[in-house]
Amino acid sequence: QEDEDGDYEELVLALRSEEDGLAEAPEHGTTATFHRCAKDPWRLPGTYVVVLKEETHLSQSERTARRLQAQAARRGYLTKILHVFHGLLPGFLVKMSGDLLELALKLPHVDYIEEDSSVFAQSIPWNLERITPPRYRADEYQPPDGGSLVEVYLLDTSIQSDHREIEGRVMVTDFENVPEEDGTRFHRQASKCDSHGTHLAGVVSGRDAGVAKGASMRSLRVLNCQGKGTVSGTLIGLEFIRKSQLVQPVGPLVVLLPLAGGYSRVLNAACQRLARAGVVLVTAAGNFRDDACLYSPASAPEVITVGATNAQDQPVTLGTLGTNFGRCVDLFAPGEDIIGASSDCSTCFVSQSGTSQAAAHVAGIAAMMLSAEPELTLAELRQRLIHFSAKDVINEAWFPEDQRVLTPNLVAALPPSTHGAGWQLFCRTVWSAHSGPTRMATAVARCAPDEELLSCSSFSRSGKRRGERMEAQGGKLVCRAHNAFGGEGVYAIARCCLLPQANCSVHTAPPAEASMGTRVHCHQQGHVLTGCSSHWEVEDLGTHKPPVLRPRGQPNQCVGHREASIHASCCHAPGLECKVKEHGIPAPQEQVTVACEEGWTLTGCSALPGTSHVLGAYAVDNTCVVRSRDVSTTGSTSEGAVTAVAICCRSRHLAQASQELQ
């Protein structure tokens, strides 16, 4: 088999004898899977990432690669091992015929195989530059800490590191892994090759137009002169960063990935591993005016995914497309007409637009936050980014209707002071993927490893759902929502909070026999109620109304429909106090809200009663939103009455700790 570029001499015709002594059978009952990019034009058939099981050692990876070569040679196929992965993910990159996939999937230790695919710079026009001087007074923006303790890695095009705006701030590593440029007549003009990366380096750390003016950067070249790279090249780049981190541990690391490709299991997995090694990854949501969950690394939960807004806080339109959106976006940031260093000359500036520019802003803000508080974990940093964002300023009408509720209405902002936020109880809302419409379909929302799940709710556009419950999965609580017969699917909504030294548990009451409804409370000493969930097996709860307001003196109680099981999230943490706040509207209304007061954080959001005309409940920042079916379809007024129940908490312990520091 000839490979496309005719590079035969380096291909290894492995000897048949290599196979001898390597007859380990694949683990019984496990089947490796094959994955490829859903976007056909972005596929790169002929190159495959073979991902091995987690505990596979380097020697086993090498042996498995040799075994593949030997078995391929036996069948008359040439293969070439391009890279053996270790340090981040075990596995190898192989150039081979697709005919060999079945064989490769049966090799020992193989977890899955992914066909290589393209990734792209996320700026427009990333190579059509309009030179403009900085259009503001530089002394208007003097950040308190310029991010000097933080190193920002940039995986992008080559960059002009001696540009006046970034000279001395960027160390160009010797890492380069890029595909050939497309087209026979492509002219490799240096300034165009450097355009995207130079601009982003300037946005992050430029002297005059940068966000974190003190941050130092390291650049890795994973995008070619056309702004195109590969998943495999990006993986090898991430591995390079991990190895550098191990060889020479420095302070906090931020990795900026201003690129996007189709959904990639392996790229997301690599990002997860790097994030769990303490690295903060920031990526572009993508410029496809589409759900960011369909792209990588934007869809990786551990990555901070950034959409783009303009000066009017509106989502950025880019030609016929625009910023991506949806539940995989963490927040938005400026991404239209952003001025930064231009590679056209050493003192030139240019304006570029896209989610790359937005991600660069957030990488700069992250660098400054980490420089001020180097011990911040990824979860703490993400929560702070969300907390300090401008809320509810984006015009959601720009997003498709079904994505509006899922897309965070947050625009990144620098904290007013980089210190002193430690006393806050930080929480965020995490939406699951859609369950799909089958009768038994469920959706699961998860918090990050060092966050606590304090409450769980669900939402269905059709209203046909069977509630939600918190359950243990792999030693951690998750939020599971249940679809109902005839439903179009549900979402699970987790409220994920930073609560140090917390001990949380779920108390469940089965459906009540009596007509008073189901109740459950936190009975352990020192435990407070942080959230209520209800789950039912019947298809339609009907109109039964339990007493909505709790009896006085029983704040630690969840109440619900008599046919539903009720789940109380009960937590003990130093100084944690919570209170229930309700807002009931007697007349039918499509939306009922209740918000926590200043100084209190929303941890739980649920609806009473749990009848079928209630679409669900979810938290938006510090407000609990309960949505009901269109009033015109609900029938009687009594059934239309809905109460939004918020549980608001604060931590006196965190407040005291903060005061002691000051």
Epitope: R137, K213, T347
Partner: antibody, heavy 115, light 109 residues
Framework: QIQLVQSGAEVKKPGASVKVSCKAS????????ISWVRQAPGQGLEWMGW????????NYAQKVQGRVTMTTDTSTSTVYMELRSLRSDDTAVYFC????????WGQGTTVTVSS | QSALTQPASVSGSPGQSITISCTGT?????????VSWYQQHPGKPPKLMIY???NRPSGVSNRFSGSKSGNTASLTISGLQAEDEADYFC?????????FGGGTKLAVL
């Protein structure tokens, strides 16, 4: 350590050319260009231009544009500044300095233009 | 004629503080964060003392500090010492080049 070492003093006649060299060491050359600055006797500093070690691009001050050429030899980590059609008011000490930030300076090269 | 205006001379006694000003326009000092200050002793190359308005390179005494307001940058030297006697130059970016001040001769009395 980071060093910029310049060539020795030159005496030239009006109308002639001079070529001063500056050898850089001790840092990643491509992260910084080299600026050239001159100082006439008893006078202030005058920025003449900049050249990139990365791609050879140049940025010349208007006052000397057309008479100055800056070049690099990456194999020897050396930058050259050639000034043509010398006049008596070009008599000065010529310094090379690292980048636009000019955080490290060469020792200076005295160029005397005299008939 | 230099693009940035500095006083020709400034003097002070040991232990005192002095301030040297550097005035430009919104196209140089006022428009950029990159104002630097250099110290030059006779027969020596200039030495960077302050960069990007107020940052000190490692090895430079914390007696030297920089600031900026509008189109004017300032260098302050506190606790004057005899070795501070030298010429001081400010510099700034412009849109495409660099400009220096005419220099200020500091005498320590």
């Amino acid at each position: 350590q980071i060093q910029l070492v310049q060539s020795g003093a030159e005496v030239k006649k009006p109308g002639a050319s001079v070529k001063v060299s500056c050898k850089a060491s001790g840092y990643t050359l491509t992260s910084y260009g080299i600026s050239w600055v001159r100082q006439a006797p008893g006078q202030g500093l005058e920025w003449m231009g900049w050249i990139s070690f990365y791609n050879g691009n140049t940025n010349y001050a208007q006052k000397v544009q057309g008479r100055v050429t800056m070049t690099t030899d990456t194999s020897t980590s050396t930058v050259y500044m050639e000034l043509r059609s010398l006049r008596s008011d070009d008599t000065a000490v010529y310094f090379c300095a690292r980048g636009y930030g000019m955080d490290v300076w060469g020792q200076g090269t005295t160029v005397t233009v005299s008939s | 004629q230099s693009a940035l205006t500095q006083p020709a001379s400034v003097s002070g006694s040991p232990g005192q503080s002095i301030t040297i000003s550097c005035t430009g326009t919104s196209s140089d000092v006022g428009g950029y964060n990159s104002v630097s200050w250099y110290q030059q002793h006779p027969g020596k190359p200039p030495k960077l003392m302050i960069y990007e308005v107020s940052n000190r390179p490692s090895g430079v005494s914390n007696r030297f500090s920089g600031s900026k307001s509008g189109n004017t940058a300032s260098l302050t030297i506190s606790g004057l010492q005899a070795e501070d006697e030298a010429d001081y130059f400010c510099s700034s970016y412009t849109s495409t080049s660099m400009v220096f001040g005419g220099g200020t001769k500091l005498a320590v009395l």
